[in-house]
């Protein structure tokens, strides 16, 4: 910070609540889309420019005036891999976290005109180009269609789609949210010959029902009904198919070939959890038992003579966990070598750290190519010579991220490509590789202002800065900004990391109120080196509140000993550790222990509520937004991963003694603000309704706010501003701030 260390002498403005809500200070991104191994697209003043990666020169790919007469507001665009067509998306209507419907038109870049014949229907649920050429697959009314050419009629692939019952090529609610993190359940083969797809059957899945109040003029609220399996309830079933798009014809129905789950899955409830094409005619599928400690990878080959797909049992790879669940949230995806005969995959090693293992498809055992008391976050690219990955190895900081390359001919030859580029400013990187990994964009997101740079893989030299946020830097020079501290405490001989957003001119000899910002879900991380402008920035800058976060037991990227500590025991150690963290912070000398608060959203709302209901005496007040209150109310896939089933033979006891409601009496000792959106499809309003009822039943006075027709994000412009204003008032009142 420029200016003096003395707060009273610093005349600069602070970062205000209005600054946060109105996004006064905007971080600039540099969002590129690679279209080849040496070219990318970038949107500038609504023109789409094509850039040469090596030399940095650009030309206009598409002028912003092209669609002036289009008559619709274009939400997004997508260029066919051969560069001949552009898919225009409009009439966007959000459904859940990832899903939406939209209208689409196709523009012929050669003829410079919209294709008017055989258009994709309105309310299409998903569209995707084939990986090469310009075939299109789309889902409409829960059925799949394929276009061989944009101007040709669609071939219908499935005929069974039925709203809320049978989903072809798209996910149902729980698969979208908890398994694939996507609406799409379609996978093109690399050359676009085959289209693989999943079919989900929700016939027996119970419905969650909630009111949607809509416009004031609506006399009777609408009832929203969504198939949503809660813990222990009937789950969707899944089938998997592959269709050869070369064989499609108008006069005969498409033949989809089913690939069935392995026998070890068919014995009970199971999930399809990963689909990866290995070659043009080889596909890998990962299946997961409902009890998510056992998964199987099948590798299936196309048999041209029969038109079938064969999955040899000898090529099955089993992944299991004896201490918890498989994967961070699900089994990791394999990265196949060019010949499809081997692959690299992130799995837990003997010590419980997630590292890269090299598999040959015909061998059971794998060879770890990385090791250490740190974790590989993701495999980013694979070439014939190198594998590129992101890890948190550097300086032993789990909250950092750097890009590495490992030589495939000698696993001892590992190079960190980002560690020393800008070590003060940049400790948290993500990457975007060109099509064949000849070039890559590094995206540094902290601790300094975000920095986007372009690099060549040939010699790993930096080519140019794409965006350095210098304009924002200049603006923030005139603002009293908080500082961020990232450190660890040691509890039971284990390092646990925390971060603190410290007020400007922080003075460790003074006493500050502290707000604990919590999530604390399995495999979460809140202590990191990312630069953020958020509510905490306002609280620290303007209100002089320390905003801290702590990664206790259950948190991720530090090995399974920490992460699996809460296996089958949600609501225990991760809750206790937040309380202990607050105690430790109190002892640091600069925290006013009479003014400690806690807040969280979603899982963080659950932990906040459990903490406030613990009777610890550490916290004066807290805010829970859209909290879970009882695990039987939440979805099966997420909940059972960590808790098993709510049956007497499995884990019913802990389901029942980990509720917020059972702690209602202790809320008399704290000030509590409970907030929830009435149209939350994810953590249902039911969860807060039950907290409220329990508190009322024992005579606890508390504050509450609902947000009509808002979902789990409470993200509409007005609601977003309202909730943060409301929470600010609550925290200021709790801390006796003017």
């Amino acid at each position: 910070n420029k200016g003096t260390d003395d707060a009273t002498a610093d005349s600069r403005k602070t970062y205000t609540l209005t600054d946060y809500l109105k996004n006064t200070y905007r971080l600039k991104l540099y969002s590129l889309r690679w279209i080849s191994d040496h070219e990318y697209l970038y949107k500038q003043e609504n023109n789409i420019l094509v850039f040469n990666a090596e030399y940095g020169n650009s030309s206009v790919f598409l002028e912003n005036s092209t669609f002036d007469e289009f008559g619709h507001s274009i939400n997004d665009y997508s260029i066919s891999p051969d560069g001949q067509f552009i898919l225009l998306e409009y009439n966007y209507v959000k459904q859940w976290r990832h899903s939406y419907t939209a209208s689409y038109d196709i523009y012929d870049l050669n003829k410079r005109q919209l294709i008017t014949e055989e258009r994709i229907p309105n309310n299409t649920q998903w569209v995707t180009w084939s990986p090469v050429g310009h075939k299109l697959a789309y889902v409409w009314n829960n059925d799949i269609y394929v276009k061989i050419e944009p101007n040709l009629p669609s071939y219908r692939i499935t005929w069974t789609g039925k709203e809320d019952i049978i989903y072809n090529g798209i996910t149902d609610w729980v698969y979208e949210e908890e398994v694939f993190s996507a609406y799409s359940a379609l996978w093109w083969s690399p050359n676009g010959t085959f289209l693989a797809y999943a079919q989900f059957n929700d016939t027996e899945v119970p419905l969650i029902e909630y009111s949607f109040y809509s416009d004031e003029s609506l006399q009777y609220p609408k009832t929203v009904r969504v198939p949503y399996p809660k813990a222990g309830a009937v789950n969707p079933t899944v089938k998997f198919f592959v269709v050869n798009t070369d064989s499609l014809s108008s006069v005969t129905n498409a033949t989809s070939i089913q690939i069935t789950a392995p026998a070890s899955m068919l014995i009970g409830d199971h999930y399809l959890c990963d689909v990866t094409w290995a070659t043009q005619e080889r596909i890998s599928l990962q299946w997961l038992r409902r009890i998510q400690n056992y998964s199987v990878m099948d590798i299936c080959d196309y048999d041209e003579s029969s038109g079938r797909w064969n999955c040899l049992v000898a090529r099955q790879h089993i992944e299991m966990s004896t201490t918890g669940w498989v994967g961070r949230f699900r089994p990791s995806e394999p990265h196949f070598t060019l010949d499809g005969n081997s692959f690299y995959k992130i799995i837990s090693n003997e010590e419980g750290y997630r590292h890269i293992c090299y598999f040959q498809i015909d061998k059971k055992d794998c060879t770890f190519i990385t090791k250490g008391t740190w974790e590989v976050i993701g495999i980013e690219a694979l070439t014939s010579d190198y594998l590129y990955y992101i890890s948190n190895e550097y300086k032993g900081m789990p909250g950092g991220r750097n890009l590495y390359k490992i030589q495939l001919s000698d696993y001892t030859k590992v190079t960190c490509l980002s560690c020393e580029l800008n070590p003060e400013r940049c400790q948290y990187y993500s990457v975007s590789f060109s099509k064949e990994a000849k070039y890559y964009q590094l995206r540094c997101s902290g601790p300094g202002l975000p920095l986007y740079t372009l690099h060549s893989s040939v010699n790993d030299k930096g080519l140019r800065v794409l965006e350095d946020n210098s304009a924002l830097d200049k603006m923030l020079q005139n603002v009293q900004m908080p500082s961020k501290k990232l450190d660890f405490i040691i509890l039971n001989e284990t390092k646990f990391w925390y971060q603190m957003i410290l007020p400007p001119h922080f003075d460790k000899s003074k006493k500050y109120p502290l707000l604990l910002d919590v999530y604390a879900g399995p495999c979460s991380q809140k202590a990191d080196t990312v630069f953020r402008l958020n509510w905490a920035t306002y609280l620290a800058s303007t209100e002089n509140i320390i905003v801290a976060s702590f990664d206790g037991r259950g948190s991720g990227y530090q090995g399974d000993k920490i992460m699996h500590a809460i296996n089958r025991r949600l609501g225990t150690f991760e809750v206790e550790d937040q309380i202990e963290a607050a105690r430790q912070f109190s002892k640091m000398g600069f925290v006013d222990n009479k003014r400690i608060a806690i807040w969280g959203w979603s899982y963080g709302g659950y932990v906040t509520s459990m903490v406030l209901g613990s009777g610890s005496g550490v916290f004066k007040c807290g805010i829970a937004v859209a909290p879970v209150s009882r695990w039987e109310y939440y979805d099966s896939v997420y909940t059972e991963r960590y808790m098993g089933l709510p049956t007497p033979e499995d884990n019913l006891d802990h389901y029942r003694n980990s509720t917020v409601m059972s702690r209602a009496e202790n809320f008399k000792q704290v000030e509590y603000l409970l907030i929830h959106g009435t149209a939350d499809d994810n953590v249902h309003f039911q969860q807060s309704a039950q907290i409220s009822k329990a508190l009322v039943d024992v005579g606890v006075d508390f504050q509450a706010m609902w947000y009509t027709d808002e979902d789990h994000g409470i993200a509409s412009s007005t609601a977003h501003q309202h909730i943060y204003t409301h929470m600010s008032h609550f925290i200021k009142q709790c801390f006796s701030l003017p």
Partner: antibody, heavy 116, light 107 residues
Amino acid sequence: EVQLVQSGGGVKQPGETLRLTCTASGFSLTTYGVHWVRQAPGKGLEWVGVIWGDGRTDYDAAFMSRVTISKDTSKSTAYLQMNSLRAEDTAVYYCMRNRHDWFDYWGQGTTVTVSS
Amino acid sequence: DILLTQSPSSLSATPGERATITCRASQGIRNNLNWYQQKPGQAPRLLIYYSSNLQSGVPSRFSGSGSGTDFTLTISRLQPEDVAAYYCQQSIKLPFTFGSGTKVEIK
């Protein structure tokens, strides 16, 4: 390279059975349908039937009772069998590859003469 | 069955001239119409698929248009090597049917 090579034509007696062969290369018969058409001397093209990639068959009603189309995918070969030949079956017979809704590759044709 | 009526049955034009062949379907077939060229003593070959799409390798002087019941094949500038019979074919419904053909000759 995609090719369809035909064999099996020649002179037949009325009432005999015809078996034509169409050997495919450069593509798989499990993916693509194979159609058969015929062309009587000096006339147009007449569709006979098809065997689809998955083995299902469809025929023109005029041939349904005496035509069978089959294939041996291991030999990449499709067959047209026609029973109870008559003089009006004299024609050049073509096999073609079905690509979506059109015929993109044709065999060279094989001449069948039905004469006593 | 869908009947395809082709006209004219033959046409004669000078090189460089425009030649137009029409094909009328007995019922609507959307755009599911293909055109084939058959040179004397040869197998037919695909020219145009789905009413207006030029098959790879076919000269750009050939073009197709139409939808529903009325379709046209146009040779913008007739060349000597275009002497052949031309057939339309519908692919919307089994049995597939062909037009009766148009013989194109050079004057």
